[in-house]
Structure formats: C-alpha cells, structure tokens
C-alpha cells in the first residue's frame, strides 16, 4: 500500500499586499484518517494558521469544497495579506489520536508579500544655511517588500550623487524602510530650487513615488547693504537711502540711528519678489542738517532673520557752506563703514 | 432545531419511476452534505447517494450508480432523489441525513424515513 | 469494497457492560461512527470520531477504535438501551455501514 503522501505544489507565492493568497495542498490518500493543519514556520514555535477541523480562523477559508466527502483538496485562501503574514506555510497531516499524531509534512510554501513602499518624506535642515554651505536632505520610506528598492536623488531634475542610502533591516523581515541622506551646496540661486527623492519599486509599476523639498525653507541669503545721500535739498535736508538687496527669506528688521540713538524702526513685509526669489527693500531718512551743530554719525542697521545686526555707518559733516554738497554718496558695502557727507 | 422531512414514497411497478423529496429545517442548508441511506424490510442500512452543499459533488452507490439521481435546491432547502428503473430490490425505507460538517462527517440527523415499495 | 463486520448479536444483563465490535481492515486508520436504531424509529448518532458523543447521548456510550476493531461499549446498560446497533466508517465517499448488532438487554 503506497504512503500517504502531503502535496505542496508551489515552491513560492507572491501575493501584493490586501489581496488573497492561495496555498495548494492536496493529500494522496484519506487514510489513515486525522486532521489537516495549516502552519506558519517550522518547529516548536511553528503558529497555527487554520485547522480543517475546528477553530475560527475569520480570514482563512478552505479552498475545496468541505462538504464533499472525499475531499482530498485542503488549499487555503487567506484574505487580505498583510507584511506580516510572509513566512513559509507548512501543510501538516495528522493521524487521528488522543491526542493527534503529526503523520506527514508537505515541503512548505513560502509567501512572499509585495508591499508598496509609503510616500517618501523628505526633511531639510533644522537651521538655514548660506550659500557655499552644504546641507543635508533626509528621506525615509517604509513598509515596502521585496527588500530591493532604488532611490535616487534630484535637485532641479539633475541627479544628485554625494548621497548615503540605508536600507534596514539588513536580514530577512515581513516589511523593510530605507533612509537616504542627500547633501546639497547651497548657492544664492537656490531660493527657488528643489529637491526630489524619486524611489521605484516593483510594486509601482514602474511609476515611481517622489517626495520634494524646497531649498527656500533650508537658505539664507543675506542681504547686501548700500547707503547713499541724494542732493541736499534747499530746505538744508539730506535725504539718505538705505537699500537692502537680494535677501531671503523676508524676515527683515532696518533700524535707523542717529549718533547711536534710534530713529526708527521698520519690519519688511508685503515685499515683491525678484525673479530668483530674493526681495529687495529700500528705507529713507531725512536729516536735517541745520539742526544739528555737530557731524551726525547715521547707521543702517539690518538684522535678517535673526542673524546678528549688519551695519552701514556715515557721518554727515555739518559745514559752513551747507550749499556745496555731494551728490548720490554712496557708503561702503562691506563691514561698518563710515562716510563723510559735505 | 434541525428537522427533515421524506416525503413521494409509494408502491410502484418494476422499471417505474419515483421521485423522493426531502424538506430540511433549523441549519443552513447549504452548508452541509446531504445523503440517502435506505433499509430494506428487516435489514440492515445501505447507503445510497450523496451530495455536497453546493450540488457540484455526487456520489453513489453501485448498486444505484446510473439508475438513481441525486439534486438538490438550496434554496428551496430540499434533497431529492430521482429513481429510475426500480427493481424490487430498491424496496426499502428511504432516509434523508445530514452529514455532521466536518471531514470526516457522521450522519447526525436523520429524517422519519419514506417507504418505497416496488412491486408488479 | 471497503467492508464491516458485526456480530448479529449481543446479549446483555441489566447494569452489566455491553460490548459490540465492528471489524474492518485497518479500521483503526479511519474514523468509526455508530448509530442506534430502536424498532420503527429512525437511527440515532450515539459515537462519532471513534470516541466522540453528540450532545444529548448519555455518559454511558463510549467508543474506541484501534488496529482492525472499533469497540462500541454501553455501561450500566438499561433496557432503554435495547435496540439495533449499526457502525459506519466515516471518512469515505461511499458511506460504508456494517451489518449491524441486535442489543437484548436480558
């Protein structure tokens, strides 16, 4: 009389995750007579998975019909695949006893669960930074299998190379995560640049996922400083200008000062934006000469973005000749400078 | 609870035909294996005919293998048994049973019974 | 054909043990059932799965099953008892019943 014998046809299955999978086992013989089990994985800590005779497994349904009576058909369908469900299944045939004897195994099916990646999510530096700095983009997906997976990196649709990629965890898992570190050279262009992380996977048919950033929210331009005075006005009146050009993000605070003291305070805000996303601003003080009978020290403050305060410092010089005067003076525009104003 | 009921039984001649019905109760019909099991006057039970939940399996005996049809409605919630070519041998009590559900299944309910009766 | 052999007879005392075989080639390896069957009533599932009772079916009926020989036992028979005992292997297509067993309870 030949053996009974516990037919597992297929090697491998692989299921995308929320659809069904179906595990085939057929047996050679009904005698000698016992239940079928189904188990995930191998050995003393093997998990039941669905018993043919009793128990209620709500996501397991036979495959054959139960109420045929020579059935010797004991596929399962599971509903719903998870990550979690990969393993290999084993179907086992017991010899009826008190208690069950394990008569015969079948070779296992492993299952293997085709998980979509989640949308990458890409986060820039905490702090800003300038241009010729270099700073990091992180990227993370998760919950994707099979563990291979590409990520690339693009900033204004050109690959990136100086990047770092981790996929964890390194051995076998029901799902995996990957993390990439791309670093960027910041340059005064990039108020209006973006970086992308573009991961394909095979479970995306092709049509990839990204997730961006914008360098607006990783930059800092600070601004360049020009002080000039337009013609002394007949009423003995300077007019001196302070701009404030090619700065990023908006977050501007101009204090005038007069000999050390305040004149006034402005806040930049409702600015037009240049072309490469900068913004331009330009303040105005009137010093009346004629009331002054000593030189007056002006100093245009800017602090930008909670940076330290930059300086343009001037004297207006008061003269005995009030009508000779410069015309569109203009301070220096490095570090603090003073100008003498006739 | 669960109840079946035989019913079409009767005396009919040699190579006649006699349709058997039974009308089940108190379990989802569909679900189970039905079966015909007769006893001739005074003997022992024989099996006759069975049927999956779906009606998509039937089986039967040698005896029967040909003459006999088993079908089922499940929706109407009945078992019938078709007989052809009656022999007075076929002579018996006719039983609907249910099978237990599971694999391995007993009869667990069984209805009154019909007596079919061939004779000329 | 698969085939099952009881014995046409037992008799038993009144709160004595009964014992009825039922005889089959490796029996043991399949799954034994038995039924009673009063006179002009219908049979009645007492054992099934060799050992197992349907609810309603007193203590008293039990049933093992091992190499060619499932045993149905009645302890503590009454006369209630008496009736035409019938096993079946359970685990075929074709249902298979034995001969039966008449019980008299003396």
């Known amino acids: 009389e030949e053996e009974l014998q516990v037919i597992q046809p297929e090697k491998s299955v692989s299921v995308a995750a929320g659809d069904s999978a179906t595990l085939n086992c057929t047996v050679s013989s009904l005698i000698p007579v016992g239940p079928i089990q189904w188990f995930r994985g191998a050995g003393p800590g093997r998990e039941l998975i669905y018993n043919l005779k009793e128990g209620h497994f709500p996501r397991v349904t036979p495959v054959s019909d139960p109420t045929k009576r020579n059935n010797m058909d004991f596929s399962i369908r599971i509903s719903n695949i998870t990550p979690a469900d990969a393993g290999t299944y084993y179907c086992v045939k017991f010899r009826k006893g008190s208690p069950d004897v394990e008569l015969k195994s079948g070779a296992g099916t492993e299952l293997s669960v085709r998980a979509k990646p989640s949308a990458p999510v890409v986060s820039g530096p905490a702090v800003r930074a300038t241009a010729e700095h270099t700073v990091s983009f992180t990227c993370e997906s998760h919950g994707f299998s099979p563990r291979d997976i590409t990520l690339k990196w693009f900033k204004n649709g050109n690959e990136l190379s100086d990047v770092q990629t981790n996929v964890d965890p390194a051995g076998k898992s029901v799902s995996y995560s990957i993390r990439s570190t791309a670093r960027v050279v910041l340059t005064r262009r990039d108020v209006h640049s973006q970086v992308i992380c573009e991961v394909a996977h095979v479970t995306l048919q092709g049509d990839p996922l990204r997730g961006t950033a914008n360098l607006s929210e990783a930059i800092r331009v600070p601004p360049f400083l020009e002080v000039t005075q337009q013609s002394m006005r007949a009423d003995n009146q300077v007019n001196v200008t302070c701009q404030v050009t090619k700065f990023y993000p908006q977050r501007l605070q101009l204090t005038w000062l007069e000999n050390g003291n305040v004149s006034r305070t402005e806040m930049a805000s409702a600015l037009p934006e240049n072309k490469d996303g900068t913004y331009n601003w330009t303040s105005w003080l009137l010093v009346n000469v004629s009331a002054h009978r000593d030189d007056v020290k002006l100093t245009c403050q800017v602090e930008h973005d909670g940076q330290p305060a930059v300086n343009k410092s001037f004297s207006v010089k008061v003269s005995a000749h009030p009508k000779e005067q410069g015309s569109n003076t203009a301070a220096e525009n490095t570090g603090t400078n003073e100008r003498n104003i006739y | 609870e669960v109840q079946l009921l035989e019913s079409g039984g009767g005396l009919v001649q040699p190579g006649g035909s006699l349709r058997l019905s039974c009308a089940a109760s108190g379990f989802t019909f569909s679900s189970y294996a039905m079966s015909w099991v007769r006893q001739a006057p005074g003997k022992g039970l024989e099996w006759v005919s069975a049927?999956?939940?779906?009606?998509?399996?039937?089986y039967y005996a040698d005896s029967v293998k040909g003459r006999f049809t088993i079908s089922r409605d499940n929706s109407k919630s009945t078992l019938y048994l078709q007989m052809n070519s009656l022999r007075a041998e076929d002579t018996a009590v006719y039983y609907c049973?249910?099978?237990?559900?599971?694999?391995?299944?007993?009869?667990?309910?069984w209805g009154q019974g019909t007596l079919v009766t061939v004779s000329s | 054909s698969y085939e099952l052999t009881q014995p046409p007879s037992v008799s038993v005392s009144p709160g004595q043990t009964a014992s009825i075989t039922c005889s089959g080639d490796k029996l043991g390896d399949r799954y034994a059932c038995w039924y009673q069957q009063k006179p002009g009533q219908s049979p009645v599932l007492v054992i099934y799965q060799d050992t197992k009772r349907p609810s309603g079916i007193p203590e008293r009926f039990s049933g093992s099953n091992s190499g060619n020989t499932a045993t149905l036992t009645i302890s503590g028979t009454q006369a209630m008892d008496e009736a035409d005992y019938y096993c079946?292997?359970?685990?075929?297509?074709?249902?298979?019943f034995g001969g039966g067993t008449k019980l008299t309870v003396l």
């Open positions: 049973a249910k099978d237990g559900g599971s694999y391995y299944p007993p009869f667990d309910y």
């Open positions: 049927i999956s939940g779906s009606g998509g399996d039937t």
């Open positions: 079946q292997a359970c685990d075929s297509s074709t249902a298979v």
